[in-house]
């Protein structure tokens, strides 16, 4: 079974800079999985942001600001990255990755 690890416990960024969050997949080939990213803001329900499927297809939640989030997959390091552009106050949250095995 696949296992996920988010090595960064926290990430502090200056306003308007870029944040990159990592999710390391083990126990399964990342190319055979879909990785989903979610955000939980204080006081709000957890929200789907973006996913990258086993075939590389990217799906974004409607209503998420365009150009704000970018998702990628690096097979060599078995890692999925979530890039948050133009970091601002509304981006303060806990971000989770999740796995769906094909």
């Amino acid at each position: 079974a696949g296992h996920l690890e988010q090595p960064q416990i926290s990430s502090t960024k200056t306003l308007s800079k870029t944040a990159r969050l990592e999710c390391v997949v083990s126990g399964i080939t990342i190319s055979a999985t879909s990785v989903y990213w979610y955000r939980e803001r204080p006081g709000e329900v957890i929200q789907f942001l973006v996913s990258i499927s086993y075939d590389g297809t990217v799906r974004k939640e409607s209503g998420i600001p365009s150009g704000k989030f970018e998702v990628d997959r690096i097979p060599e390091t078995s890692t999925s990255t979530l890039t948050i552009h133009n970091v601002e106050k509304q981006d303060i949250a806990t971000y989770y990755c999740a796995l769906w095995e094909v």
């Epitope: 306003l15 204080p42 601002e88 106050k89 509304q90």
Partner: antibody, heavy 124, light 107 residues
């Protein structure tokens, strides 16, 4: 001195349009989320709209959704509210307000700097 | 939409009195609550945020408590400049909603 100054209010007929402006000084405008809050004559405060520092996140009250548009120009230290299809119930003093800032130690919400407001009257 | 209900709607008090205003939320908002003071024909002023954190420059006679759905603003010893209207506001959820206000006037 940290200051917000609104302008653009006036008398307009129902169905008409107005564009409010808010000029900021004394702080790094581009680092702060901004808000519009209105107060009808003799009534309480009503939140109207918010915009995040880089304009990625925009929110509206249901009462103005589809009619009002919030925007900002960080290069000009300015916040705007485009008001279309105005109704009598939009008559109010409109304040722009700054959201509490963010530090590496904490973040909270709340509006810590307010302008004196500009008056919008919608009447035939 | 979260409805914020303040009580009382008005209170008459004297200088030196202790005054408590209550704000109730229609659903839990953790500690995401702010209190404002507004003098007639003036802009509101932030007093307290995060339910109990005093804004810089606000006198220590003002205090906030509560979490979840019930919150209080207390003025321990009312001063002449404290006669005003007080509003609570939640920022747990969009839309940000205010209470209807509590007027503190002179007895």
């Amino acid at each position: 001195e940290v200051q917000l100054v609104e302008s653009g209010g006036g008398l307009v007929k129902p169905g008409g349009s107005l564009r409010l402006s808010c000029s900021a000084s004394g702080f790094t405008f581009s680092n702060y989320d901004m808000n519009w809050v209105r107060q009808a004559p003799g009534k309480g405060l009503e939140w109207v709209s918010s915009i995040s520092s880089s304009s990625s996140y925009i929110y509206y009250a249901d009462s103005v959704k589809g009619r009002f548009t919030i925007s900002r120009d960080n290069a000009k230290n300015s916040l705007y509210l485009q008001m279309n299809s105005l109704r009598a119930e939009d008559t109010a003093v409109y304040h722009c307000a700054r959201d509490v800032g963010v530090t590496t130690d904490y973040y909270y919400y709340g509006m810590d700097v307010w302008g004196q407001g500009t008056t919008v009257t919608v009447s035939s | 939409e979260i409805v914020m209900t303040q009580s009382p709607s008005s209170v008459s008090a004297s200088v030196g009195d202790r005054v408590t205003i209550t704000c109730r939320a229609s659903q839990g908002i953790n500690s995401w609550l702010a209190w404002y003071q507004q003098d007639p024909y003036k802009a509101p002023k932030l007093l307290i945020y995060a339910a109990s954190t005093l804004q810089s420059g606000v006198p220590s006679r003002f205090g906030g408590r509560g979490s979840g759905t019930e919150f209080t603003l207390t003025i321990s010893s009312l001063q002449p400049e404290d006669f005003a209207v007080y509003y609570c506001q939640q920022y747990n959820n969009w839309p940000r909603t205010f209470g209807q206000g509590t007027k503190v006037d002179i007895k």
